[in-house]
């Protein structure tokens, strides 16, 4: 038991979220970070999972409504599968109808997240800022 | 004991955020939410009192950079005091010096937040959306 | 067979308004996004607007933004365009078109046959 | 915004093949879509995504894109293939479709 140092009790009309990364942004139960330096996909990639995370996966608009709000253009998880045309998550599972409007920003198999759920294609290789996520059991 | 029903251990690895109401986003350990209805400053901080909170303070960049990322304009708990020139908080405390970049949209006394820790001057009585704020002690 | 017929097209003044439709079949209407081009007497083909196939995300020309509204009914399988503030130079055929990958803005793979709108005092 | 710039026409002999470009700045960084639109009908799609062409359109039809130049060649030029011809593309910076010009293609 020796990884656990804390114990809180939760009121009923508040609840805590979690449980984060330090410092992450926590939000109905799932953890966000944004990261201001700029790396290619694959880099941005790599920085989430050293982190025991993943990049920004867009599943819900109810669940991740702040998305809506968010400025600028930032890497998430979804790639494009050349083969048979669809964009799919890290995870492999393909991207939903209506969840996001994908727009060609330039030529490319990789996507950067822009506000009110839009995803912009772009060159994996271009350095851009990134979204982690990591979802809370 | 009657108010808590949870008991959580939480590893050193990660932590909780909170506690927040429920579905507010929750970063180190303040509360917010952004509000899409449109309602004057007055209407806005009404509610944002209504729901055990306030207007958005801007107090620290580093605290609160989660709000360089926000798009849009959206009421935040700041006035100006018209007999000494001097903006203030909801809770009286004076606007810090270069912790908000103030910018006229027009002749008013409330101002928006707008991204990269910007304030615009609005006239109070104008709909806008808004950010309720709370802090965790 | 996909099938794109638009409607509401005619003579309107200058100012006046006017409301286009375009009825959809012959696919997943509320998957694709749609879109409206419009082609000017002997003139070249122009974009006007785009809307995704859930209606979050709207698009416009600038030629037209703040006097055009689209809009779609997903139920009905219909696609709108609310023309208000005409002027001379929006005399053109409006084609409305469905984009060509259900997940993207990209291309427009079918095209109705068009309406007319003639603005005229 | 981002510009398309089509020669105003092309003119070809039956049987030979027929180039029309389209220009614009880096447009081999972008997606483009070459549209037909015979006289008094709609537009059709004869080749997306630079390339690639729709079911039931000849192979005649074939598309390139690199650099500033994306070309529509038409092959063994037919007298139906006579037409006028956009190029159209995305422009993701302002969120607007552009087309080119258009290219009237006389077939001699």
């Known amino acids: 038991n020796s990884l656990f140092n804390q114990e809180v009790q939760i009121p009923l009309t508040e609840s805590y979220c979690g449980p984060c990364p330090k410092n992450w942004i926590c939000y109905k139960n799932n953890c966000y970070q944004f990261f201001n330096e700029s790396k290619n996909w694959y880099e941005s990639q790599a920085s989430c999972m050293s982190q025991n995370a993943s990049l920004l996966k867009v599943y819900s608009k109810e669940d991740q409504d702040l998305l809506k709000l968010v400025k600028s253009y930032h890497w998430m998880g979804l790639v494009h599968i050349p083969t048979n045309g669809s964009w799919q998550w890290e995870d492999g599972s393909i991207l939903s109808p209506n969840l996001l409007t994908i727009i060609e920003m330039q030529k490319g198999d990789c996507a950067l997240y822009a506000s009110s759920f839009k995803g912009y294609i772009e060159n994996c290789s271009i350095p851009n800022t990134y979204i982690c996520m990591q979802r809370t059991v | 004991n009657s108010l808590f029903n949870q008991e959580v251990q939480i590893p050193l690895t990660e932590s909780y955020c909170g506690p927040c109401p429920k579905n507010w986003i929750c970063y180190k350990n303040n509360c917010y939410q952004f509000f899409n209805e449109s309602k004057n400053w007055y209407e806005s901080q009404a509610s944002c009192m209504s729901q055990n909170a306030s207007l958005l303070k801007v107090y620290s960049k580093e605290d609160q950079d989660l709000l360089k990322l926000v798009k849009s304009y959206h009421w935040m708990g700041l006035v100006h005091i018209p007999t000494n020139g001097s903006w203030q908080w909801e809770d009286g405390s004076i606007l810090s010096p270069n912790l908000l970049t103030i910018i006229e949209m027009q002749k008013g006394d409330c101002a928006l937040y707008a991204s990269s820790f910007k304030g615009y001057i609005e006239n109070c009585s104008i709909p806008n959306t808004y950010i309720c704020m709370q802090r965790t002690v | 067979e996909v099938q794109l017929l638009e409607s509401g097209g005619g003579l309107v003044q200058p100012g006046g308004s006017l409301r286009l439709s375009c009825a959809a079949s012959?696919?997943?209407?509320?998957?694709?996004?749609m879109t409206w081009v419009r082609q000017a007497p002997g003139k070249g083909l122009e974009w006007v607007s785009i809307?995704?196939?859930?209606?979050?995300?709207?698009f416009y020309a600038d030629s037209v933004k703040g006097r055009f509204t689209i809009s779609r009914d997903n139920s009905r399988n219909t696609l709108y365009l609310q023309m208000d503030s005409l002027r001379a130079e929006d005399t053109a055929v409006y084609y409305c078109?469905?984009?060509?990958?259900?997940?993207?803005?990209?291309?427009?793979?079918?095209w109705g046959q068009g309406t007319l709108v003639t603005v005229s005092s | 915004s981002y510009v398309l710039t089509q020669p105003p026409s092309v003119s070809v002999a039956p049987g030979q093949t027929a180039r029309i470009t389209c220009g614009g700045n880096?447009?081999?960084?972008?997606?483009v879509h070459w549209y037909q639109q015979k006289a008094g009908q709609a537009p059709v799609l004869v080749v997306y995504?630079?390339?690639d062409r729709p079911s039931g359109i000849p192979e005649r039809f074939s598309g390139s894109n690199s650099g500033n130049t994306a070309t529509l060649t038409i092959s063994r030029v037919e007298a139906g293939d006579e037409a006028d011809y956009y190029c159209?593309?995305?422009?993701?910076?302002?969120?607007?479709?552009?087309f080119g010009g258009g290219t009237k293609l006389t077939v001699l």
């Open positions: 995504d630079d390339s």
């Open positions: 809307i995704s196939g859930s209606g979050d995300h709207t």
């Open positions: 012959g696919f997943t209407f509320s998957i694709y996004a």
């Open positions: 880096n447009i081999g960084s972008k997606s």
């Open positions: 078109a469905k984009e060509g990958k259900w997940v993207q803005l990209s291309h427009f793979a079918n």
């Open positions: 159209q593309v995305w422009d993701g910076r302002s969120d607007h479709v552009v």
